[in-house]
């Protein structure tokens, strides 16, 4: 005869564990049902009756199967230097990431707690390492033969144009100025060469940060007298 399927609550066999989407309730000493994402345990199980689950209230959530007595509070609204990349729902927390031109100076489990503007390299300095979602721009002085005449978080040092006859030599913050209207070579594609050529700059836009999708763990959740419920193993 096939073994009968036990319905929750049931006493587990000695040495065995509860099944998927169940937890061992130490008070009842039974395997009981967990609550689905978006719900929480409103009434705990007994030896004869199962867990009663209820929906999370507005602005609260549970992301995993759980047996927590209260849902987690969603994080506060995103600040003006952030964009909401994931809304607060009953099953997921709000995620705020930094808007373009900013990076995350203080991260949290998902998204960013504190954004800061990307550093702008002043004239004479170029971007050595571009900013990322979580790191600031690194500037470096323009090496001899290169320059940057902008205050920018994206522009690198570029080579001076090479003149047949140099009117004004280039320096770290200024391109060379030629007397001839046709310099031998310009390293700036698309440059306009009228008496004193001015290079056009290509603008590098900061990629929009991708939201993290790691599951949250609730280190501040009331757990009841049993193993951690949110973020526990077993789905």
């Amino acid at each position: 005869l096939p073994a009968q399927v036990a319905f929750t609550p049931y006493a587990p066999e000695p040495g065995s564990t509860c099944r998927l989407r169940e937890y061992y309730d130490q008070t009842a000493q039974m395997c009981c049902s967990k609550c689905s994402p978006g719900q929480h345990a409103k009434v705990f199980c007994t030896k004869t009756s199962d867990t009663v689950c209820d929906s999370c209230e507005d602005s609260t959530y549970t992301q995993l199967w759980n047996w927590v007595p209260e849902c987690l509070s969603c994080g506060s609204r995103c600040s003006s230097d952030q964009v909401e990349t994931q809304a607060c729902t009953r099953e997921q927390n709000r995620i705020c990431t930094c808007r373009p031109g900013w990076y995350c100076a203080l991260s949290k489990q998902e998204g960013c707690r504190l954004c800061a503007p990307l550093r702008k390299c002043r004239p004479g300095f170029g971007v050595a390492r571009p900013g990322t979602e979580t790191s600031d721009v690194v500037c470096k002085p323009c090496a001899p033969g290169t320059f940057s005449n902008t205050t920018s978080s994206t522009d690198i040092c570029r080579p001076h144009q090479i003149c047949n006859v140099v009117a004004i030599p280039g320096n770290a913050s200024m391109d060379a100025v030629c007397t001839s209207t046709s310099p031998t070579r310009s390293m700036a594609p698309g440059a306009v060469h009228l008496p004193q050529p001015v290079s056009t700059r290509s603008q590098h836009t900061q990629p929009t940060p991708e939201p993290s999708t790691a599951p949250s763990t609730s280190f501040l959740l009331p757990m009841g007298p049993s193993p951690p419920a949110e973020g526990s193993t077993g789905d």
């Epitope: 409103k42 009434v43 705990f44 007595p69 501040l220 009331p222 009841g224 007298p225």
Partner: antibody
């Protein structure tokens, strides 16, 4: 045997504050909520709020916000309820009660009578 | 806040009587209702939670039923130790609120 033992009776003047303690024993203090419920003389029961000692999260009845502070000392398994700006209508027996889920109270303290009188 | 109205506010009964106390909520509380017993000078004691679940150690003569807004506590055969005041309490919506109480007295 689960026990919640409260501090003794208090007499306070209007405008003063009172701090009532509730010492828990024979269960895991950090795994249960402690609620505070009061009962004016000859009247019904009124829920004031809760604290979860495991993470010190509190939830207060709107009526008492700004006047009530609930705290817990896990080292001594003691919960505290402080009520400030006392008035005569705060004269009541104050009970602490334990719950595992948030809404039903399975064990209660013996109560602390707080009298507010000029 | 959800208002809880108990009736009657008091009743007289004899040992052995079947006693019924009702509790009406001002809105649907979805079975999130508890019953407590309180004796003079003592703290309340949990009898029944979630409408009909008997708390451990509570005699089986106590039972609860109901749904929506209307709930009932029944004592099937009143015992001398049952003379007390009974309170209902909802835990559907914060703040948790109690009924005004029903005093069960000896006839």
């Amino acid at each position: 045997q689960v026990q919640l033992v409260q501090s003794g009776a208090e007499v306070k003047k209007p405008g003063a504050s009172v701090k009532v303690s509730c010492k828990a024993s024979d269960y895991s203090f950090t795994n249960y909520y402690i609620h505070w419920v009061r009962q004016a003389p000859g009247q019904g029961l009124e829920w004031m709020g809760w604290i979860y000692p495991g993470n010190v999260i509190t939830k207060y009845h709107e009526k008492f916000k700004g006047r009530v502070t609930m705290t817990a000392d896990t080292s001594t398994s003691t919960a505290y309820m402080e009520l400030s700006s006392l008035r005569s209508e705060d004269t009541a027996v104050y009970y602490c009660a334990r719950s595992r889920a948030t809404g039903y109270f399975d064990y209660w303290g013996q109560g602390t009578l707080v009298t507010v009188s000029s | 806040d959800i208002q809880m109205t108990q009736s009657p506010s008091s009743l007289s009964a004899s040992v052995g009587d079947r006693v019924t106390i009702t509790c009406r909520a001002s809105q649907d509380i979805r079975n999130y209702l508890n019953w407590y017993q309180q004796k003079p000078g003592k703290a309340p004691k949990l009898l029944i939670y979630y409408t009909s679940r008997l708390h451990s150690g509570v005699p089986s003569r106590f039972s609860g039923s109901g749904s929506g807004t209307d709930y009932t506590l029944t004592i099937s055969s009143l015992q001398p130790e049952d003379f007390a005041t009974y309170y209902c309490q909802q835990f559907n919506t914060l703040p948790w609120t109690f009924g005004g109480g029903t005093k069960v007295e000896i006839k």
